[in-house]
């Protein structure tokens, strides 16, 4: 009976299966295979075609999101015949039950918060769970500390980011006794979600004609060197009329972070504060504490 089924619907003979944990699509190896390819098509008709694994009976998708639903497809030619099979991977569960407004940010160099909102059609007993997989080791991190709202998980706090890599896959699953809950998934770059601390060790030293501002680059989660930073200095004269523009100075990161500017004695009271950003993204940190220099009677 099974062999009849195969001839009537030859696609079934490939037995295509997808493991969402490993993002691995696999099928039954066919003897004398001359060609094989796998790909997925998403709801926007974008096609993703990964490299085949060495055994040619599986392929791994590296950077894909599945929550909108995708269709996997496998084409195999053998010396005798050709096979094709589609595998629908829908996001089963009631529409509108998945977590929404999902976002994460890294702060203080080694902490991360992720937050989300309950889906609009989710039942009262819904519970959400966050899993994170890194791109390199495919290791799964389960949320260690949930942030709750009336007993429902609506966020997660991580204080150990050692398992993350530069790009990570975030999955929010849901459960309910009443109905099926859809999942939400997202790929996030750590460099895009990190909020830097302001620069540290800000000092100002003045002589008769100039003032020299020095600072240290902030400690970050990402491995960044000095040229990867951009700084902004706000040099502000105290007790000026409201509406007077501050002097904002852009300074590229350097091995010795410093800015020397002319300021002759007697000098009025000034303050300086500094903020930092990744030079590629310019996602500014908050300002450092203002440092005052000069005198009231300057």
């Amino acid at each position: 009976e099974k062999s009849d089924l195969r001839t009537v619907a030859p696609a079934s003979s490939l037995n295509v299966r997808f493991d969402s944990r490993t993002m691995n699509l696999s099928w039954d190896c066919q003897e004398n295979t001359t060609f094989s390819k796998c790909f997925l098509t998403d709801k926007k008709n974008r096609v993703v075609e990964p490299r085949l694994s060495n055994n040619e009976c599986s392929c791994t998708f590296r950077e894909i999101c599945l929550h909108e639903g995708v269709t996997f497809e496998v084409h195999v030619n053998t010396s005798q015949r050709g096979f094709q099979q589609k595998l629908l991977y829908p996001n089963s569960g009631r529409e509108g039950t998945a977590a929404q407004n999902f976002s994460c940010f890294i702060y203080n160099a080694d902490l991360m918060n992720c937050t989300w909102a309950r889906g609009p059609t989710a039942p009262r007993d819904v519970q959400y769970f966050l899993y994170i997989r890194n791109s390199k080791r495919r290791r799964e991190i389960r949320c260690p500390y949930y942030i709750q709202d009336s007993g429902t998980h609506v966020g997660c706090h991580l204080d150990n980011l050692s398992g993350l890599t530069s790009r990570n896959y975030f999955l929010v699953n849901g459960t309910s006794r009443e109905i099926g809950i859809q999942f939400f998934d997202s790929l996030l770059d750590t460099k895009k979600i990190e909020r830097f601390n302001p620069p540290s060790n800000v000092t100002v030293r003045c002589n008769t004609t100039h003032c020299l501002v020095r600072w240290k680059q902030p400690r970050t989660y990402q491995k960044l060197s000095y040229l990867d930073f951009q700084y902004q200095l706000d040099v502000h004269r105290k007790n000026t009329q409201p509406g007077t523009e501050n002097l904002l100075i852009n300074v590229s990161g350097d091995l010795e972070n410093r800015y020397n500017f002319p300021s002759s004695e007697p000098r009025a009271k000034h303050s300086v504060k500094i903020r930092a950003a990744d030079v590629r993204i310019l996602n500014w940190s908050s300002w450092s504490e203002a440092i005052e220099f000069g005198s009231d009677d300057g």
Epitope: K223, L224, S225, Y226, L227, D228, L255, E256, R280
Partner: antibody, heavy 120, light 111 residues
Framework: QVQLVQSGAEVKKPGASVKVSCKIS????????IHWVRQTPTKGFEWMGG????????VYAQRFQGRVTMTEDTSIDTAYLTLSSLRSDDTAVYYC?????????????WGKGTMVTVSS | QAVLTQPSSVSGAPGQRVTISCTGS?????????VSWYQQLPGTAPKLLIY???KRPSGVPDRFSASKSGTSASLAITGLQADDEADYYC???????????FGGGTKLTVL
């Protein structure tokens, strides 16, 4: 001002080892990522290896693996390159450099280079 | 054979504009990894001219600019001066195998 001062030129026989030093002044070595690059007239620049903060260890280019060792003595702000089993095609100028950006690995400060000649 | 391909030489008269190309592949420049450019005057160590594809370290004149598109990058020098005569190298990271790669170098002659 940061400076990288390298040891003097060396002449070695095939099969021998050479150790080149790179002394950092004006900054603490422990805060830097030092890499080694060599230059030959035939092959141009070849990256040999250096400290990768992502891996938190010194990483080596595949073609030098097993023959090269890079060490650091942070107490005297000095990095060392040792290349063993020298061959005539290891004749090159060896540079130490500081990584100024980890995005694409840009080398900002360079030593003046150490000429190593391998000849029988 | 360098993985990043550059023309062996270019030339231009003082005041002119010249460009130097650097062609890579999908495992380096197109991956996309950032490109850096270096100037090496005869008998000296290289000097960083460009990093992050188009950023200049402090002290590098704005006559030097660079861009990147797909698997290629290019360095442009405007208002050519006699002391620009040097060798120019592009450099990027490569994931196959994971190594830092340099171009073969381009000799710039100021006529």
């Amino acid at each position: 001002q940061v400076q990288l001062v390298q040891s003097g030129a060396e002449v070695k026989k095939p099969g021998a080892s050479v150790k080149v030093s790179c002394k950092i002044s004006g900054h603490s070595l422990s805060e830097l990522s030092i890499h080694w690059v060599r230059q030959t007239p035939t092959k141009g620049f070849e990256w040999m290896g250096g400290f990768d903060p992502e891996e938190n260890e010194i990483v080596y280019a595949q073609r030098f693996q097993g023959r090269v060792t890079m060490t650091e003595d942070t107490s005297i702000d000095t990095a060392y390159l040792t290349l063993s089993s020298l061959r005539s095609d290891d004749t090159a100028v060896y540079y130490c450099s500081i990584v100024g950006s980890f995005s694409g690995w840009a080398f900002d400060y360079w030593g003046k280079g150490t000429m190593v000649t391998v000849s029988s | 054979q360098a993985v990043l391909t550059q023309p062996s030489s270019v030339s231009g008269a003082p005041g002119q504009r010249v460009t130097i190309s650097c062609t890579g592949s999908g495992s380096n420049i197109g991956a996309p990894y950032d490109v850096s450019w270096y100037q090496q005057l005869p008998g000296t160590a290289p000097k960083l001219l460009i990093y992050h594809n188009n950023k200049r370290p402090s002290g590098v004149p704005d006559r030097f600019s660079a861009s990147k598109s797909g698997t290629s990058a290019s360095l442009a020098i405007t208002g050519l001066q006699a002391d620009d005569e040097a060798d120019y190298y592009c450099q990027s990271y490569d994931s196959e195998p994971t190594e830092i790669r340099f171009g073969g170098g381009t000799k710039l002659t100021v006529l």
